[in-house]
């Protein structure tokens, strides 16, 4: 079997809402993955599990099941959304994210994703980690790759 390549492309959009009373931030973050099947047979993308970390704390998790089948030598782009919550010990961020005196309220989030593919009963897992900028102060749609955090800090692939 040849490789199945998973490439984390970046944040596609981030939609933000607040609970003023509880100083809580809700961020719905949609990410984009490219999955390439280098084989001469179809593979099934069985599930995608993702989590988002802020300051080493997991603030959101998501799991998608039975996603798609990728044909031989084909590539598919897949979007997945992770609902995240910034509250309690991190409520100090509420003040930053809602500060009207600044235009962009970028925070650095670590995106972790694991893709499980299957073919002929064989299962394979591929994981990626990326640091991304996300604006927690307004709804934002990103050009792919636009939210990338300094490459120098990216973990080695």
């Amino acid at each position: 079997p040849r490789s199945i390549d998973v490439k984390y492309i970046g944040v596609k959009s981030a939609y933000v809402s607040y609970d003023v009373q509880k100083r809580t931030i809700y961020l719905n973050i949609t990410n984009t993955l490219n999955i390439t099947n280098n084989n001469y047979y179809s593979v099934e993308v069985e599930n995608i599990t993702a989590q988002v970390q802020f300051s080493k704390t997991v603030i959101g998790k998501a799991r998608l099941n039975n996603i798609t089948i990728i044909g031989p030598l084909d590539m598919k782009q897949i979007d997945y959304t992770v609902p995240t919550v910034i509250a309690e010990e991190m409520s100090y961020m509420y003040d930053f994210c809602t500060l009207i005196s600044i235009k962009v309220h970028n925070i650095v989030l670590m995106m972790q994703v694991t893709v499980t593919t299957t073919y002929f009963g064989h299962s394979e897992q591929i994981s990626q980690e990326r640091y991304q900028y996300v604006d927690c102060g307004r709804n934002t749609t990103y050009q792919l790759g636009q939210s990338e955090y300094l490459n120098v800090l990216q973990p080695q692939q």
Epitope: D19, V20, Q21, K22, R23, T24, Y26, V85, A87, E88, S91
Partner: antibody, heavy 119, light 112 residues
């Protein structure tokens, strides 16, 4: 230390209005929500609403929407609650309360103002 | 509105005994941010209520460790491991998950 000073009593006539004050000290006034709570003699506690002193935004219990108006004066670190069209049902102790950082529990209470509605 | 039901209404105890007060809410108190905003207060005669326990099980500063809170969802309990004279008064549970915030009817802790 945190203090919330309220006048002890207010005697008002039915149909009139009263404006209760709550002077805060010992902390940054604009950082914490101020809540108002009603307690009728020998009865339980009822949340009236709260106000964000930094911008004046309020959240009211629907039951008190037409009864209570919450305001603040940042310059004197004082919160106010105006009660209108008073009836005997409004006779109660009214507490002003400072919320915690999240505005959800009430660590600091004023001594309460006893409002007596009587002709 | 969320109805908070406390039992018992009155709780006669001997000093040194353990006391347990139950508080039940008409709907779950788990907020969409995952936190349960259930608190306990003690009101002594002629005084303002005082915060004892916040967010189910966290003791407020200065509150003795004989006070403990537990529970989840809709069922909550306040326990006093060894009742002392200064613990007598009316205990209220309160929820601030849903607006309007509401209180239980109170439980009077008194000497047997």
């Amino acid at each position: 230390q945190v203090q919330l000073q309220q006048p002890g009593t207010e005697l008002v006539k039915p149909g009139a209005l009263v404006k209760l004050s709550c002077k805060a000290s010992g902390y940054t006034f604009t950082t914490y929500w101020i809540h108002w709570v009603k307690q009728r003699p020998g009865q339980g506690l009822e949340w009236i609403g709260n106000i964000n002193p930094s911008n004046g935004n309020t959240k009211n219990n629907e039951r008190f929407k037409t009864k209570a108006t919450l305001t603040v004066d940042k310059s004197s670190s004082t919160a106010y609650m105006q009660l209108s069209s008073l009836t005997s049902e409004d006779s109660a102790v009214y507490y002003c309360v400072r919320g915690d950082y999240y505005g959800t529990s009430y660590p600091f209470w004023g001594q309460g103002t006893l409002v007596t509605v009587s002709s | 509105d969320v109805v908070m039901t406390q039992t018992p209404l009155s709780l006669p105890v001997s000093l040194g005994d353990q006391a347990s007060i139950s508080c039940r809410s008409s709907q779950s108190l788990v907020h969409s941010n995952g936190i349960t905003y259930l608190h306990w207060y003690l009101q002594k005669p002629g005084q303002s209520p005082k915060l004892l326990i916040y967010k189910v099980s966290n003791r407020f500063s200065g509150v003795p460790d004989r006070f403990s809170g537990s529970g989840s969802g809709t069922d909550f309990t306040l326990k006093i491991s060894r009742v002392e004279a200064e613990d007598l008064g009316v205990y209220f549970c309160s929820q601030s998950t849903h607006v309007p915030y509401t209180f239980g009817g109170g439980t009077k802790l008194e000497i047997k």
